[in-house]
């Protein structure tokens, strides 16, 4: 296994607007210029892909237009933001990093960030 160490925070609390941000940092053994980052969500022992992007070092991550993710890169760090989260989206979000170019190829998978999402309380009706 072409394992590479990936670090990410253990816990993140989403904002009241359903936005969660965390940093995914990888210890690159090579001199990669093009990197693929995938965010996976693990819940109830099922793993699903949330979003993915391949980026050139020093450039912004370009996710698909309809993606709920955005991100920026700086060196071996990727700053990921996931938006549109609701309480039901609470779960473990795993950062997967692949060094795609040039060879050698390396793969790293973080331990996951537990993102807690609390739906905001509806505003009470006002008599004023």
């Amino acid at each position: 296994c072409k394992a590479m160490h990936v670090a990410q925070p253990a816990v993140v609390l989403a904002s009241s607007r359903g936005i969660a941000s965390f940093v995914c940092e990888y210890a690159s053994p090579g001199k990669a210029t093009e990197v693929r980052v995938t965010v996976l969500r693990q819940a109830d022992s099922q793993v699903t892909e949330v979003c993915a992007a391949t980026y050139m070092m020093g450039n912004e991550l370009t996710f698909l237009d309809d993606s709920i993710c955005t991100g920026t890169s700086s060196g071996n760090q990727v700053n990921l933001t996931i938006q549109g989260l609701r309480a039901m989206d609470t779960g473990l979000y795993i950062c997967k990093v692949e060094l795609m170019y040039p060879p050698p190829y390396y793969l790293g998978i973080g331990n996951g960030t537990q993102i807690y999402v609390i739906d905001p309380e509806p505003c009470p009706d006002s008599d004023f």
Partner: antibody, heavy 117, light 111 residues
């Protein structure tokens, strides 16, 4: 199904040029580096070059330097090989191959190029 | 560039024989504990097929009679009991650095 399909082969005159295409399907083309490899009749596999996932970087084997150009159009899921100043020794089957997890995990079926007058 | 030298260039064997092919690199193809050396099988008129990746990992769907070993500069592909469908040409390739390079191939023929 993940596949690569080459096209554009055929008979070419010595001194001429060829442009081969490699159409990808079944995977996110823009995530992968792709290579061209060729095989002359009865000979071994020979690496021609590679293009990075974005298309921003290419690298060629020394013997093809200055005579070959690899390009890609990620919006069309297509890879190209342009080879100029063709000679009889360029007669070969040309393959495109995906560099998946550090190895060639998907190959095209190959397209035969014959250089002859 | 890393040169790969395979031996023998051809061999004749019978069904049931144990066959060993070696691949020697001009410099180490190891990096951070991984050997970036892979083995392919090719039959006439067909594209190469991956057998072994990272020197010793068996590709999914490949029979267990195929195995790979080695590290650094010296690698071996072994077919424990040759089957009729194994008569083909075998190539090693290094994917540590560009340019990628192939061995010259080993043709396994029927004795």
């Amino acid at each position: 199904e993940v596949q690569l399909v080459e096209s554009g082969g055929g008979l070419v005159q010595p001194g001429g040029s060829l442009r081969l295409s490699c159409a990808a399907s079944g995977f996110t083309f823009s995530d992968y580096a792709i290579h061209w490899v060729r095989q002359a009749p009865g000979k071994g596999l020979e690496w021609i070059g590679i293009i990075s996932p974005s298309g921003g970087s290419t690298k060629y084997a020394q013997k093809f330097q200055g005579r070959v150009t690899i390009s890609r159009d990620n919006s069309k899921n297509t890879l190209y090989l342009q080879l100029n100043s063709l000679r009889a020794e360029d007669t070969a089957v040309y393959y495109c191959a995906r560099l998946g997890y550090g190895y060639f995990d998907v190959w095209g079926q190959g397209t035969l190029v014959t250089v002859s007058s | 560039d890393i040169q790969l030298t395979q031996s023998p260039s051809s061999l004749s064997a019978s069904v049931g024989d144990r066959v060993t092919i070696t691949c020697r690199a001009s410099q180490s193809v190891d990096f951070y504990g991984i050997s970036f050396l892979h083995w392919y099988q090719q039959k006439p008129g067909k594209a190469p097929k991956l057998l072994i990746y990272d020197a010793s990992s068996l590709e999914s769907g490949v029979p267990s009679r195929f195995s790979g070993s080695g590290s650094g500069t010296d690698f071996t592909l072994t077919i424990s009991s040759l089957q009729p469908e194994d008569f083909a040409t075998y190539y090693c390739v290094q994917a540590l650095q560009l340019p990628l390079t192939f061995g010259q191939g080993t043709k396994v023929e029927i004795k």
